[in-house]
């Protein structure tokens, strides 16, 4: 499984942002895929769950992501990306997008860097 | 790293009421959820509460919810949970833990005796 | 609320061999968590959603399953692995534990 993101990513604080991850594996799409995003923040604390994709989306029951995510994916488009809505400023951190699709060999994750910003900033 | 300090044991009389402590260390104590597990000896784990220390809110088991509460003091990184109406029912090891992949770290718990 | 029913209770394993812990569910959950617990410590996370290894255990530990059936497997037991394991699901409030499996050496 390969796995592609952005890379980085800057959203306005309240507003809401698609976290894009994207994948290819040689094996078909099944019941057996599996997608798990984590959220590490910026002062490097543990890392933490924010969302799980197997059949069903499966939001987190605990912590600072619960009734602020949602899937946004689309396995059978190779889509495993997520929702994260009313952003807040210590929502600045790495997002990882992990994808298992048995039996094709796990890959490196892919990871996100958000930053949550006043107001965009604008390049020329 | 991080660390759960509790206090080793308390023992206290039937119909009492207790305060167990629970100090956090080693990050950042408002950015995980702080959560209460109960251990009886044979009985197995059962989930007492969460508390969000950004704001004091708190989920709790239904089963809990006239027995315990839980709040936190910010200034010191420490939460606690209150038992009320003590039993021996309420013997047991009380664990904090916080929630981030999992319940990922714990408390070395504490071990509560109702015993008049 | 969701009942987790872990087998066997008790279980012997001798160095080597393969190791299966089942965990089932009394309604469907999505996810299902695993730890290990030795005596006189604290319970330490083994395998978060599913099949997810934490941090330091050994790559001969997976974790599978889905709906109300979850497993935990050992390809090869070793010494260090003797312990009382739980199973514990959180798609559904509030968050449950299996009674665990202890493993002993044979």
């Known amino acids: 499984v390969e796995i592609y993101t952005s890379g980085a990513l800057e959203a306005v604080n309240g507003t809401d942002a698609r976290l894009k991850c994207t994948f290819s594996s040689f094996a078909p799409v099944g019941d057996a895929l599996t997608v798990t995003w984590n959220f590490r923040p910026l002062d490097g604390g543990p890392e933490q769950f924010v969302f799980y994709y197997h059949i069903d989306p499966f939001q987190p029951m605990s912590g600072r992501f619960k009734d602020r995510v949602s899937w946004d994916g689309n396995p059978e488009r190779y889509d495993a990306s997520i929702l994260l809505w009313k952003l807040q400023f210590d929502d600045n951190g790495t997002y990882t997008c992990q994808v298992k699709n048995p039996p094709d060999v796990d890959g490196l994750v892919g990871t996100i860097r958000l930053s949550v910003v006043h107001t965009v900033r604008f390049s020329e | 790293q991080v660390q759960l300090q509790q206090p080793g044991a308390e023992l206290v009389k039937p119909g009492a009421s207790v305060k167990l402590s629970c100090k956090a260390s080693?990050?950042?104590?408002?950015n995980y959820w702080m959560h209460w597990v109960k251990l009886r000896p044979g009985q197995g784990f059962e989930w007492i509460g969460e508390i969000n220390p950004t704001n004091g809110g708190t989920d709790y088991n239904e089963k809990f919810k006239r027995k315990a509460t839980l709040t936190v003091d910010k200034s010191s990184s420490t939460a606690y949970m209150q038992l009320s109406s003590l039993t021996s029912e309420d013997s047991a090891v009380y664990y904090c833990?916080?929630?981030?992949?999992?319940?990922?770290?714990w408390g070395q718990g504490t071990t509560l005796t109702v015993s008049s | 609320q969701i009942v987790l029913t872990q087998s066997p209770a008790l279980m012997s394993a001798s160095p080597g061999e393969r190791v299966t812990l089942t965990c089932s569910a009394s309604s469907s959950v999505g996810y299902m968590y695993w730890y290990q617990q030795k005596p006189g410590s604290s319970p330490k996370p083994w395998i978060y959603v599913t099949s997810n290894l934490a941090s330091g255990v050994p790559a001969r530990f997976s974790g599978s399953g889905s709906g109300t059936s979850y497993s935990l497997t050992i390809s090869s037991m070793e010494a260090e692995d003797a312990a009382t394991y739980y199973c514990?699901?959180?798609?559904?409030?509030?968050?449950?534990f299996g009674a665990g499996t202890k493993l002993e050496l044979k």
């Open positions: 833990t916080i929630y981030t992949t999992a319940l990922d770290y």
């Open positions: 514990q699901q959180w798609s559904s409030n509030p968050p449950t």
């Open positions: 080693g990050y950042t104590f408002t």
